[in-house]
């Protein structure tokens, strides 16, 4: 299950907004979706991996069909590894993780 997570840090470097959509995925009935993340002490590793130690992040469905999650405050040089966990009565499934460095996704003012 591949769910693309894209993030952007505001020009004032105060928050990072991440967005994702499930519109390309079929058969999500009776499933709950949750963004989970792991903040590293250092930058992103070459190959992101799902960490057993992680936290859920509240995300809200927007009018355009995308879910939006806001990280605030942010640690500019910490790697945020994130993935979507799909929970179903039959079990859970994790999307491939992506790692984002807030400093590298800054949207200019």
């Amino acid at each position: 299950v591949n769910i693309n997570i894209s993030c952007e840090t505001d020009g004032y470097l105060t928050k990072m907004t991440c967005r994702w959509s499930t519109s390309t995925i079929q058969s999500l009935a009776e499933s709950t979706l949750q963004l989970r993340y792991h903040r590293s002490s250092l930058y992103c590793s070459d190959i992101p991996s799902i960490h057993p130690i992680s936290e859920p992040k509240d995300c809200y469905l927007q009018s355009d069909g995308f879910y939006e999650c806001i990280f605030q405050p942010i640690f500019l040089l910490s790697g945020y590894t994130m993935w979507i966990r799909i929970n179903h009565s039959l079990g859970s499934l994790d999307s491939p993780p992506t790692c984002v460095l807030p400093d590298s996704v800054v949207k200019p003012l």
Partner: antibody, heavy 117, light 107 residues
Framework: QVKLLESGPGLVAPSESLSITCTIS????????VSWIRQPPGKGLEWLGV???????YFNSLFKSRLSITRDNSKSQVFLEMDSLQTDDTAMYYC???????????WGQGTSVTVSS | ELVMTQSPKFMSTSIGDRVNITCKAT??????VTWYQQKPGQSPQALIF???NRHTGVPARFTGSGSGTDFTLTINNVKSEDLADYFC?????????FGSGTKLEIK
């Protein structure tokens, strides 16, 4: 400057409960997790549990049934409560700050707890 | 539970020597290992995080290496103030677990 300071009762009677407070400064409880660790006299370190920045808690399964970790963000305090103490719970109890979801980078000086009648 | 087997338990060394302390994990913990120094009567202080990165203010004579299951803390040019207990910690998975410790004594 990151600081953590534990305060506890010192002496607890067997079968009673333990309450310890960790007062922090130099970081925010909503940003970084805080773990509790203990060290019996002359022995090694034992992780008890953690409360993460988002508020979720995880416990060492050895203590889960009698352990509670809560916090008061406005007072910059984290609380450890442990029930049904026995003499082998005698230890130095530490709180420690996490760096993100990784290592514990700063520790308090610890508070000594003796379980005895 | 993930066990961290630390050795040696005791080590007697002389000023200026080089010391190696090892920790072996029962599972792959990537680089999620921290080394701590605990001086008598004090709380643990972080020396090395993520297996090989020195914590703020830690002298360059302390180095860490390893990944996966085998990790080493090396102290070069041992000084008298290095008299302490040393612990490893894995923070890859719950429950977080420590090595049993190494007591470093100065001859």
């Amino acid at each position: 400057q990151v600081k953590l300071l534990e305060s506890g009762p010192g002496l607890v009677a067997p079968s009673e409960s333990l309450s310890i407070t960790c007062t922090i400064s130099g970081f925010s409880l909503t940003d970084d997790g805080v773990s509790w660790i203990r060290q019996p006299p002359g022995k090694g370190l034992e992780w008890l549990g953690v409360i993460w920045g988002g508020g979720s808690t995880y416990f060492n399964s050895l203590f889960k049934s009698r352990l509670s970790i809560t916090r008061d963000n406005s007072k910059s305090q984290v609380f450890l409560e442990m029930d049904s103490l026995q003499t082998d719970d005698t230890a130095m109890y530490y709180c420690a700050k996490h760096d993100g979801h990784e290592t514990m980078d700063y520790w308090g000086q610890g508070t000594s707890v003796t379980v005895s009648s | 539970e993930l066990v961290m087997t630390q050795s040696p338990k005791f080590m007697s060394t002389s000023i200026g020597d080089r010391v190696n302390i090892t920790c072996k994990a029962t599972q792959n913990v990537r680089t999620a290992v921290t080394w701590y120094q605990q001086k008598p009567g004090q709380s643990p202080q972080a020396l090395i995080f993520l297996a090989s990165n020195r914590h703020t203010g830690v002298p360059a004579r302390f180095t860490g290496s390893g990944s996966g299951t085998d990790f080493t803390l090396t102290i070069n040019n041992v000084k008298s103030e290095d008299l302490a207990d040393y612990f490893c910690l894995q923070h890859w998975n719950y429950p977080l677990t420590f090595g049993s410790g190494t007591k470093l004594e100065i001859k």
